[in-house]
Interface confidence: low
């Protein structure tokens, strides 16, 4: 059995045995999605590991359960993000909004969709069911982690950019008008994707296909694993954690807190001043009348903003904690109990990682009744079964009766909910 040997894998068998062999070594476990190496001496025994070290002790029930969860997330996430992207691309009524939020939503839907399409099938096949040999070659190994990381960065940065866009639209609507033109927004989103690709470039040099069989010859010993020194791998992981989690989390936490506070003030003003609220920065403000139902929408908006932050932390924190375990837990601290914990923790973190890509359409899009209506209409167009079941629209609402002395007023409130 192995002391320090993981995964992007799945759980070990339930743990009466305190020395269960670590899943695919720390090898695959720390790896997928993300990566890590057999801790400690891995670099010194790169071609000497026994082939069965690469196995993952996952009972069939766990595999089936994980597969079922993944498939459910895959279907819901793929449908949600595809319809979102399709809706945003095709519906003129959304594109005509003065707000450029739909560009950000479309970019987020694309990064989520790519994450699900590119990462989940490979992980399901090569990290949950067939742990070795790695089936996609050296280029496939490097490409997989490059694309996966690029999509991860893109998702995180898109979430952050959405918060920036909403912050400007709600707290600085006048600045927003000049700062957030369509061309600038397109350039900004292009920059996000370029930055994501550049940030993921280290994966092309970090990962690679290696043969971990005893003599380095058996095809069954092929694994997709870090090929560089462990210390460098740890630096890559930490930079990744900072850029794809800590930085975006700080951005969305701070900005969404500011936005939520602003919306709370708007709700209070609406109640105190006969449903009239003031929107704007310190140098320019404007007033608007808000119908009673809109107050509820603003309250709902506050809850949504909080949900966005909570969802980001809940879905991404465990995933990054798991990867940081590799950086900060030494060889000697990898006890058999910790391995057992890690196996189950791995499964939970990866499921949550994909939950993030699945719920983003719900969090960012379906909370808007206007978008939801168009979304369901699009789904009805795309899916005849759905069309037959929906005899009448599931949602209807009156047009916003928002009056203002400024053209930005309706934008500032209608789009507050993402």
């Amino acid at each position: 059995m192995r002391l320090n040997s993981s995964a992007p894998g799945t759980p070990g068998t339930p743990a009466a045995d305190p020395f269960q062999r670590a899943q695919a070594g720390l090898e695959e476990a720390l790896l997928a999605p993300g990566f890590g190496n057999a801790s400690g001496n891995a670099s010194e025994r790169v071609l000497a590991a026994p082939s069965s070290e690469l196995d993952v002790n996952t009972d069939i029930y766990s595999k089936v359960l994980v597969t079922a969860v993944y498939l459910a997330l895959f279907v819901v996430g793929t449908v949600g993000n595809t319809v979102t992207a399709f809706t945003l691309a095709r519906k003129k009524s959304l594109q005509s909004l003065q707000s450029t939020v739909h560009y950000h939503l479309g970019s987020l839907a694309l990064s989520d969709l790519l994450t699900l399409l590119l990462a989940m099938p490979v992980e399901l096949y090569n990290f949950i069911w067939v742990h070795h040999p790695w089936a996609f070659g050296d280029a496939g190994c490097r490409g997989y982690y490059f694309l996966r990381d690029a999509c991860t960065y893109a998702t995180a940065l898109n979430v952050a950019s959405l918060s920036v866009e909403r912050y400007l639209a709600i707290c600085h609507p006048f600045k927003a008008k000049t700062l957030m033109s369509r061309s600038r927004t397109k350039k900004f989103i292009s920059a996000i994707w370029l930055a994501s690709a550049l940030l993921a470039v280290p994966m092309l040099f970090t990962m690679g296909e290696q043969n971990r069989s005893a003599d380095g010859q058996h095809a069954g010993g092929l694994v997709c694993t870090p090929t560089i020194h462990t210390a460098t791998v740890k630096v890559v992981i930490q930079v990744n954690t900072f850029m794809s989690f800590i930085f975006p989390m700080v951005v969305i936490s701070v900005l969404n807190t500011i936005i939520a506070n602003k919306l709370t003030v708007m709700v209070r003003q609406a109640a105190e001043q006969g449903q009239v609220c003031t929107v704007g920065g310190e140098h320019s403000t404007f007033s608007m009348a808000i119908e009673p139902g809109r107050v509820q929408a603003l309250r709902h908006g506050v809850r949504v903003l909080r949900a966005v932050v909570i969802a980001f932390v809940v879905c991404w924190l465990p995933y990054h904690v798991r990867r940081l375990m590799f950086c900060y837990i030494s060889d000697e601290q990898w006890t058999p109990f910790l391995y057992d914990f890690y196996h189950y923790f791995y499964m939970v973190t990866n499921a949550l990682f994909y939950v993030s890509s699945t719920i983003n359409p719900i969090l960012y899009n379906l909370v808007s009744a206007n978008f939801r209506h168009i979304f369901l209409a699009t789904l009805a167009c795309l899916c005849p079964v759905w069309r037959r079941r929906r005899k009448r629209p599931a949602f209807s609402r009156k047009a916003d009766s928002v009056s203002s002395n400024h053209t930005l007023s309706s934008n500032a409130t209608r789009e507050t909910l993402y």
């Epitope: 059995m1 192995r2 002391l3 320090n4 040997s5 045995d17 305190p18 020395f19 062999r21 670590a22 070594g25 057999a38 400690g40 001496n41 010194e44 025994r45 000497a48 590991a49 026994p50 082939s51 069965s52 070290e53 196995d55 002790n57 005893a214 030494s330 060889d331 000697e332 006890t335």
Partner: antibody
Framework: AVTLDESGGGLQTPGRALSLVCKAS????????MIWVRQTPGKGLEWVAS????????YYAPAVKGRATISRDNGQSTVRLQLNNLRAEDTATYFC????????????????WGHGTEVIVSS | ALTQPSSVSANLGGTVKITCSGS??????YGWYQQKAPGSAPVTVI????NRPSNIPSRFSGSASGSTATLTITGVRAEDEAVYFC???????????FGAGTTLTVL
């Protein structure tokens, strides 16, 4: 070539303590777990204890648990087995063995053996 | 414990299989060790189910499935006559374990 040289065996008195030392060479000692195995006269092999690369984690057979202590000195490339409260059934040839890597530790993970040192526990 | 046949025989140049089963598991890995004389140093012929040390001839091979491991020697030679022990891990006692040994006689 990998060599493992055991020492410290000989005639021992019941109830006393025994200390066996294994000197390793021919490989990067600190990268491999080490194992002690014994063989009683005319009998089979019996796994006794294992120690991980850094020395913090140790594993013992039920027959010696509480009486045995395995330790290592990576600087000196030595591994030591101390066995207290010796019994007649501890009479055996004790082999020092090298694990296949830094993660294997049990009886299916040995790739090199020492020549052994004979221990006789008798009053 | 691990169970092995106490003895097997094989014709010179023939093939022999020695099995080992019990409370071990292929997941944790089996090893096969050759001992020419009692008290002499064992030699590892297979470790971790299927892996053969570089100094061991290719006629020795190992396989494992579930709780059973098999050592196969093809083209048996006179010098292969020895006692073969299998080693593994007992998940009920969390300890390393060996089989009682199988004596191979070459005819």
């Amino acid at each position: 070539a990998v060599t493992l040289d055991e020492s410290g065996g000989g005639l021992q008195t019941p109830g006393r303590a025994l200390s066996l030392v294994c000197k390793a060479s021919g490989f990067t000692f600190s990268s491999f777990n080490m194992i002690w195995v014994r063989q009683t006269p005319g009998k089979g092999l019996e796994w006794v204890a294992s120690i991980c690369t850094g020395g913090s984690y140790t594993y013992y057979a039920p027959a010696v648990k509480g009486r045995a202590t395995i330790s290592r000195d990576n600087g000196q490339s030595t591994v030591r087995l101390q066995l207290n409260n010796l019994r007649a059934e501890d009479t055996a040839t004790y082999f020092c063995a090298k694990s296949v890597d830094g993660v294997g530790w049990h009886a299916g993970q040995i790739d090199a053996w020492g020549h052994g040192t004979e221990v006789i526990v008798s009053s | 414990a691990l169970t092995q046949p106490s003895s097997v025989s094989a014709n010179l140049g023939g093939t022999v299989k020695i099995t080992c089963s019990g409370s071990g598991s292929s997941w944790h890995g089996y090893g096969w060790y050759q001992q020419k004389a009692p008290g002499s140093a064992p030699v590892t012929v297979i470790y971790d189910n299927t892996n053969r040390p570089s100094n061991i001839p290719s006629r020795f091979s190992g396989s494992a499935s579930g709780s059973t491991a098999t050592l196969t020697i093809t083209g048996v030679r006179a010098e292969d006559e020895a006692v073969y022990f299998c080693g593994g891990y007992d998940s009920s006692t969390y300890a390393g374990i060996f089989g009682a040994g199988t004596t191979l006689t070459v005819l």
